[in-house]
Amino acid sequence: FERTRSLQDPCSNCPAGTFCDNNRNQICSPCPPNSFSSAGGQRTCDICRQCKGVFRTRKECSSTSNAECDCTPGFHCLGAGCSMCEQDCKQGQELTKKGCKDCCFGTFNDQKRGICRPWTNCSLDGKSVLVNGTKERDVVCGPSPADLSPGASSVTPPAPAREPGHSPQ
């Protein structure tokens, strides 16, 4: 038999890691293997998440908490709780429907994920380009042209329009 101390709803006495088993006189049965309950008073245990394929286990499931997944090397997490894994690209690239593509001139991506972003337009802040941008790095803005010695000049190319089809999948 099972002793509890609650005089109200017997299920309220069931702690995390157990469920209130209506088929067995509402005793607090331990969650079966590969299932969990993270709060008390639950009438079922939830099935543990399984990190398979491109997912790998970051934290094992237990009777009171679900497993947590991350992504295998070459992929990164997307969505709440790493609900999806997306392919990494190299720095200087972005993921398109056709795979990883180099950033267009005037744009950069300094990460293995995300989209290519336009170089900073230094002239909008009244500054000049100190270091040119690359596919992997943004431009580095320097002092404004007025601060430069006479005869010095700096040209900042306009940021090109984004090409269609360059959003991540």
């Epitope: 006495n13 607090c28 049965s29």
Partner: antibody
């Protein structure tokens, strides 16, 4: 080292009481690890006595034959579980084992103590 | 209450033999069954849990099967260290749910 160590066994007269202890080391009882008691009379089968929820709740699971004579309790601060045995009879003579019932092992007993002998005799 | 019935209660076998032990539950326990090995004067050792999952460090010659009420422990090729008593246990908690079978003694 991960282990369970029982103590408190010995000779007791019929009708008497005894409290066995089981100290856990190398791990903590939790919602994933329930401490249990199992006994084995000389030359006989294993007999399940009961278990207690490993977390902070006092839920116990007991074999019906104990009829309240045996009570399992736990002191989390000492990581120790107890078996209080009252109204002892000659047929309670047995080796008493403490075992860990683990969620990770399908609630099977994946860790056992060495056992402590209880002899009920006048 | 759940009762566990093991058979046979004892058996004689030789090294290299295939040995099969059965366990029957008085009501369905799904796959919530464990098998143990016990040698004289020692505590039981977990062999198999969840009816068919081998416990850590247990040789692959041991295997378990079954679900519901009927379960089997098989030793594919008996080794000298396997002579012992084997117990099944329901791990279906509550209502006397964790009962043991009464063992099968495997002797030479």
């Amino acid at each position: 080292e991960v282990q369970l160590v029982e103590s408190g066994g010995g000779l007791v007269q019929p009708g008497g009481s005894l409290r066995l202890s089981c100290a856990a080391s190398g791990f903590s009882f939790s919602a994933n690890y329930y401490p249990c008691w199992v006994r084995q009379a000389p030359g006989k089968c294993l007999e399940w006595i009961g278990c207690i929820y490993g977390g902070s709740s006092d839920i116990t699971y007991d074999a019906n034959w104990t009829k309240g004579r045996f009570t399992i309790s736990r002191d989390n601060s000492k990581n120790t579980v107890y078996l209080q045995m009252n109204s002892l009879r000659a047929e309670d003579t047995a080796v008493y084992y403490c075992a860990r019932s683990a969620w990770y092992s399908g609630w099977g007993g994946d860790l056992w103590g060495q056992g402590t002998l209880v002899t009920v005799s006048s | 209450d759940i009762q566990m019935t093991q058979s046979p209660s004892s058996l004689s076998a030789s090294v290299g033999d295939r040995v099969t032990i059965t366990c029957q539950a008085s009501q369905s326990i799904s796959n919530r069954l464990a098998w143990y090995q016990q040698k004289p004067g020692k505590a039981p050792k977990l062999l198999i849990y969840s009816a068919s999952t081998l416990a850590s460090g247990v040789p692959s010659r041991f295997s378990g099967s079954g679900s519901g009420t009927d379960f089997t422990l098989t030793i594919s090729s008996l080794q000298p260290e396997d002579f012992a008593t084997y117990y099944c246990q329901s791990t279906y908690y509550g209502n006397d749910g964790n009962a043991f079978g009464c063992g099968t003694k495997v002797t030479v």
